[in-house]
């Protein structure tokens, strides 16, 4: 069974551009989480969804960040406009 699938694996963009990250959770999982990890700030929970509904987005108070989960098998995290300090590893995770 395939695990959580994210795309793209790598993204390089110019400051001010829009970035969209995509995630396909494990089939049957009803919770989805977006995290950000940097050396300076560690691992931060940005937002999580339960049954496609955003439950807590307090990890992304900047309105440059937005996340959607239109159906049980797909979610996006968008940054618009992007800033150099957004450089990080972004993780998507899912759970039952």
């Amino acid at each position: 069974d395939a695990g959580v699938i994210q795309s793209p694996r790598h993204e390089v963009t110019e400051m001010g551009q829009e970035v969209t990250l995509r995630c396909k959770p494990i089939s049957g999982h009803n919770s989805l989480f977006w995290y950000r990890q940097t050396m300076m700030r560690g691992l931060e929970l940005l937002i999580y969804f339960n049954n496609n509904v955003p439950i807590d987005d307090s990890g992304m108070p900047e309105d440059r960040f937005s996340a959607k989960m239109p159906n049980a098998s797909f979610s996006t995290l968008k940054i618009q406009p992007s800033e150099p300090r957004d450089s990080a590893v972004y993780f998507c995770a899912s759970s039952l």
């Epitope: 940005l46 900047e62 309105d63």
Partner: antibody
């Protein structure tokens, strides 16, 4: 009914410390981001700090980094602001506010901090 | 930091007047948020995401704008509207406020 009640303000000497508290009720505190905002006498609003529900995401105003520390205890429904090395220019009313509608949708009544010798 | 500049800083108007307050950002923002504050009281959220009225806010208040310039309009001033108004941005931390616009009775 959402309620935010600040406490811990008072008179402190320059260089001193103070810890402000904000007791929250009427909503699920453990799911909400929280802000501190201050207002010096006769001046405008100044954003101080933000903390996410689980404390993993924290932001500070650039000028306050290193002196002020935001924290929360979700088991006590309480938000804190630890203020060290206080200066006269930190004299202000300090408000806690709940993050909602992408902004600050509920505010406390404020607690007054006076830094003076 | 993104600096927000409100104009005018002071505004004298009469009951029934239509008034507009402008908030200009030094860098483009996605949305602007507006608050009302009366003397000795905490601020109150008026408008979020540029144009959405917070619960309980009368429909005479409206917001608009994009990019670097946003406006708050009160279509017909009521006695209870005389207060100080602040804009704020959440596009990028630090979450700066405008310096405020004090609306006084003429």
């Amino acid at each position: 009914e959402v309620q935010l009640v600040e406490s811990g303000g008072g008179l402190v000497q320059p260089g001193g410390s103070l810890r402000l508290s904000c007791a929250a009720s009427g909503f699920t505190f453990s799911n909400q981001g929280m802000h501190w905002v201050r207002q010096a006498p006769g001046k405008g609003l100044e954003w101080v700090s933000y903390i996410s529900s689980g404390s993993s995401t924290i932001y500070y105003a650039d000028t306050l980094k290193g002196r002020f520390t935001i924290s929360r205890d979700n088991s006590k429904n309480t938000l804190y602001l630890q203020m060290n090395s206080l200066r006269a220019e930190d004299t202000a009313v300090y408000y806690c506010a709940r993050r909602g509608e992408g902004a600050m949708d509920y505010w406390g009544q404020g607690t007054t901090v006076t830094v003076s010798s | 930091d993104n600096q927000l500049t409100q104009s005018p800083s002071f505004l004298s108007a009469s009951v029934g007047d239509r008034v507009t307050i402008t908030c200009r950002a030094s860098s483009s923002v996605n949305y602007i948020y507006w608050y009302q504050q009366k003397p000795g009281k905490a601020p109150k959220l008026l408008i979020y995401y540029t144009s959405n009225l917070a619960p309980g806010v009368p429909s005479r208040f409206s917001g608009s704008g994009s990019g670097n310039e946003y406006t708050l309009t009160i279509s017909s001033l009521q006695p209870e509207d005389f207060a100080t108004y602040y804009c704020q941005q959440f596009t990028s931390s630090p979450f700066t406020f405008g310096q405020g616009t004090k609306l006084e009775i003429k």
